[in-house]
């Protein structure tokens, strides 16, 4: 029987007795800034090169023994989950070992930094096909480590690393809080959380997903035919590299925006138990569990879409929060959240080139967050079109009035303090999807894009009754680009994608009298591209 | 993920550019910082990555590195360059007391300067 | 699925010996600290000895030292129970059982989280008696 | 060596009941203590380990809790499968001992 992480992560199709999905990652270099290894453990001779880089702290207290055994504990278990021949996920991926970390597992910023810097040189002299690199370690929030990272991955290669495994925000950890890397968290057979002694994965929005990381089953360094169950955020990130691998191997061209979104879209859904996280980091954690593509091809016609939680904006009255894209990827929409409900609202606006979403915190607030939907548009000419607070009593409306130009998301933004509260809902006139309406006293911005084959529409979800979430959801084929609440629901907190589905939150209802203002409308924006599709048919 | 609107703990020393015959004035009047991990038992003291702007040249490095050492002897500071950056990130890792911070925070072309810490294997 | 299969019980004599032999199947095996654990008629459960997964380390309960040994054949699946000197105390059933148990971990140390014995065999008698 | 105390050594239940069983270390063992279920004939079944944690296909009415010497076994409402004989277990570097059994009975 396979181990049950393999399971987990082994789409239906692939399964059988043997884990043996198609080409196990042949085309790629995996790279593991780790512990020393044992080259010669029967799960991994042949496929990983010890490299000569080896910068490593002295090993603390006078009463330590440096076992051999124990000095390749960690690095040898990992290995062997990326690229072990019974264990492994990805069984024709080659590795390079670099020792960063000691015999009991510590090393230091300035180790790791020259570790990546070793793997940049090496790549310009030897270029070869796509590179992973693996991080399972984390120090504290490190500037100078992110931006090694950000160079690296920048330079073409996709890093992966731990969200480390001390129960808390993974942005307070390096290399887990660079935005280049992808970060991992770790959950066990049950897709709970993995609890670590008293502590256990981190958390947060700084994660990117989440993979199998307790109980698993990988080379032990005691002797080359051991096995030994070892269980952290650094065997989750593992996983990831070796699916990393895969997807490389099977498409050699694919970014490092591409592979994220990717990752993201065949993880599994809203199975994680949520409650094990602290209430305050449930929403901004994802609830996903990654997984291998069920077939290796035949992705590219898709929409693809992620959402992307700034930093908390703090709570002074003019603070603000920005959430960003990365360099390849289009903002579609941008939306904001307050657990107070005190907010004034969110805009998109160029910074340095690029849109990036400001969400703005109102008086008396505790903070907002700002929410950009980040996506996968080839060849897109996006544009935002503002309209400013109308004189009259209709509301302010605004839409895409360049030719071709489709509504991918709307923002709304006031200067107000308090929206009025008393106004009635603004409703949308039918047969008008490609505008965005607001409150008069609010400025709208409508995210207006032209890329080959796109096309749009709006799908609404009302409750007369006061609800705290109003979900709308895009159909199969389509891709949640935009989300936002209808005007005059006055006590909503913020609206934010989960996934395909767009969440309006509201105050707890016990607080809102069940009056007209009650009612609450999610609306979604969904999209799909006719024009990926085709080339993906071409192509095959 | 973490961006420069970042919510993490650091501490910044922000220091001006005071006149120091041996120091140049970092350019525009940009301040140079100085970042530590917030995590006190992970802090490694005594050894520093100083990062230099972005566009600086290797030479450019090597010039800098050797310019902090001999303004560290003259005040009678030993300090070691443990390695000089290049192809990620421009700069240089030193072995020096904290008391020379201020004064390698002026040196030219200085990005930033980060306290060594602690990883740990997950 | 994991299963374990003990054998080698039977009677003897005090004074004699047996072994005890359980066979596994899976790699996870060789992945897991494993156990012996006796059930003595109509007694409670007592835990016997245990190895290491590389059988580098191996921990026995007092009244046994010096008897028993524990062993495990990782390219065989195997693990055994040599019993020497047996006593009509050690009457019992004999169960196998995998120690569930995985390392992570912390700041510069390397921890073992024990989940407890979660797979056993069906049991294997052991009567000692003239 | 470290001693498990368990009381009671029987209880008498019905079928609907909440019983708690307990467990008494003769010196601290933090958090490492498992509890399994055994039926006439058949090998023991893991149910909790690390004093509180439901070990995986183990119905959510048993659960356990307690640390450093005191420990419970609680069945919310005692199902006709539960009547079968409780032990717990503690871990101590690598070395275990087990408490000596309840009987949990049908009243």
């Known amino acids: 029987s396979i181990p049950w992480n393999l399971e987990r992560i082994t789409p239906p199709r692939y399964r059988a007795d043997e884990y043996q999905p198609p080409d196990g990652g042949s085309l790629v270099e995996v790279y593991l800034l780790d512990t020393s290894i044992q080259s010669d453990h029967r799960e991994i001779e042949g496929r990983v090169m010890v490299t000569d880089f080896e910068n490593v702290p002295e090993e603390d207290g006078t009463r330590f023994h440096r076992q051999a055994s124990k000095c390749d504990s960690h690095g040898t278990h990992l290995a062997g989950v990326v690229s072990g021949r019974d264990a492994g996920v990805a069984k024709g991926a080659s590795m390079r070992s670099l020792r960063v970390l000691n015999c009991q597992g510590k090393g230091t910023v300035s180790g790791t930094l020259i570790g990546l810097e070793f793997i940049r040189k090496s790549q310009l002299v030897q270029p070869v096909g796509p590179l992973v690199v693996l991080l399972p370690l984390a120090g504290g929030y490190s500037r100078v480590l992110n931006a090694a990272c950000q160079r690296l991955a920048r330079a073409g290669v996709v890093l992966v690393t731990a969200a480390g495994n001390f129960r808390d925000d993974a942005c307070l950890y390096s290399p887990a809080s660079a935005p280049e890397v992808i970060t991992v968290g770790a959950t066990n057979a049950q897709d709970q959380p993995v609890t670590l002694g008293t502590l256990g994965t981190n958390f947060g929005r700084c994660v990117d997903l989440f993979a199998p990381g307790e109980d698993i089953i990988g080379a032990s360094s005691d002797c080359s035919t051991c096995f030994v169950s070892q269980s952290g955020t650094s065997q989750a990130a593992a996983h990831v590299a070796g699916i990393a691998a895969m997807m490389l191997s099977a498409e050699p061209e694919l970014t490092l925006a591409e592979l994220r979104q990717r990752l993201i879209h065949f993880s599994a859904k809203d199975v994680i138990n949520e409650a094990w996280f602290p209430e305050d980091q449930r929403v901004l954690t994802p609830n996903l569990v990654a997984a291998l593509p069920p077939s290796t091809h035949g992705a590219g016609w898709q929409l693809f879409c992620r959402t992307v939680w700034s930093a908390h904006s703090g709570p002074t009255r003019m603070a603000t929060a920005v959430a960003r894209c990365a360099p390849d990827e289009e903002l579609l929409s941008c939306s904001s959240f307050s657990r107070s409900g005190k907010r004034r609202g969110e805009r998109m606006e160029a910074q340095g080139g690029k849109l990036v979403c400001r969400a703005h915190n109102a008086f008396g607030g505790e903070g907002v967050y700002a929410i950009a939907r980040c996506c996968l548009l080839p060849q897109a000419n996006c544009s935002v079109h503002t309209a400013p607070p109308a004189e009259a009593s209709m509301g302010t409306r605004v839409h895409c009035h360049q030719q071709g130009h489709v509504l991918t998301g709307c923002s709304s933004h006031w200067e107000v303090e308090d929206l009025g509260t008393h106004k009635p809902p603004v409703l949308r006139p039918r047969g008008q999807p490609n505008q965005c309406v607001g409150h008069r006293e609010a400025s709208i911005h409508a995210s207006c894009c032209h890329a080959p084959g796109l096309e749009c529409k709006v799908k609404e979800h009302g409750i007369p009754a006061p609800q705290e979430q109003v979900t709308v959801a895009c159909e199969e084929g389509w891709t949640l680009t935009g989300c936002s609440a209808l005007p005059g629901t006055s006590h909503v907190l913020g609206a934010y994608a989960v996934d395909n589905t767009c969440v309006v939150r509201s105050r707890d209802v016990s607080t809102t009298g069940s009056t007209s203002e009650g009612a609450v409308t999610a609306v979604a924006i969904c999209c799909r591209s006719r024009h990926l599709a085709q080339a993906s048919q071409e192509l095959q | 993920q973490e961006d420069e609107d970042g919510d993490y703990e650091e501490l910044v020393l922000a220091l001006r550019s005071e006149e120091d015959g041996l120091a140049e004035a970092p350019e525009h009047g940009t301040t140079a910082t100085f970042h530590r991990c917030a995590k006190d038992p992970w802090r490694l003291p005594g050894t520093y990555v100083v990062v230099l702007k972005e566009e600086t040249h290797l030479s450019q490095s090597e010039r800098t590195a050797r310019r902090l050492q001999a303004q560290a002897a003259r005040r009678g500071y030993l300090t070691k360059i443990l390695h000089v950056f290049h192809g990620l990130l421009p700069g240089f890792l030193v072995k020096m007391s904290g008391d020379l911070l201020e004064l390698a925070l002026k040196l030219p072309h200085v990005d930033y300067i980060e306290e060594d810490s602690s990883v740990f294997a997950q | 699925e994991v299963q374990l299969v003990e054998s080698g019980g039977g009677l003897v004599q005090p004074g004699g010996s047996l072994r005890l032999s359980c066979a596994a199947s899976?790699?996870?095996?060789?992945?897991?600290?494993m156990s012996w654990v006796r059930q003595a008629p109509g007694k409670g459960l007592e835990w016997v000895a245990n190895?290491?997964?590389?059988?580098?380390?191996?921990y026995y309960v007092d009244s046994v030292k010096g008897r028993f040994t524990i062993s495990r054949d990782i390219a065989k699946n195997s693990l055994y129970l040599q019993m020497n000197s047996l006593r009509a105390e050690d009457t019992a059933v004999y169960y196998c059982?995998?120690?569930?148990?995985?390392?992570?971990?912390?700041?510069?140390?390397?921890?073992?989280?024990?989940?407890?014995?979660?797979?056993w065999g069906q049991g294997t008698t052991v009567t000692v008696s003239s | 060596d470290i001693q498990m105390t368990q009381s009671p050594s029987t209880l008498s239940a019905s079928v609907g009941d909440r019983v708690t069983i307990t467990c008494r270390a003769s010196q601290s063992i933090s958090s490492w203590l498992a509890w399994y279920q055994q039926k006439p004939g058949k090998a023991p079944k893991l149910l909790i380990y690390?004093?509180?944690s439901l070990e995986s296909g183990v119905p959510s009415r048993f659960s356990g809790s307690g640390s450093g010497t005191e420990f419970t076994l609680t069945i919310s409402s005692l199902q006709p499968d539960d009547f079968a004989t409780y032990y717990c277990?503690?871990?101590?570097?690598?070395?275990?001992?087990f408490g000596q059994g309840t009987k949990l009975e049908i009243k």
């Open positions: 899976g790699i996870t095996f060789s992945s897991y600290w």
């Open positions: 059982a995998r120690d569930r148990g995985t390392y992570y971990y912390t700041e510069g140390s390397y921890n073992y989280y024990y989940y407890g014995m979660d797979v």
């Open positions: 690390k004093a509180s």
């Open positions: 190895i290491k997964q590389d059988g580098s380390e191996k």
């Open positions: 277990q503690q871990y101590n570097s690598y070395s275990y001992t």
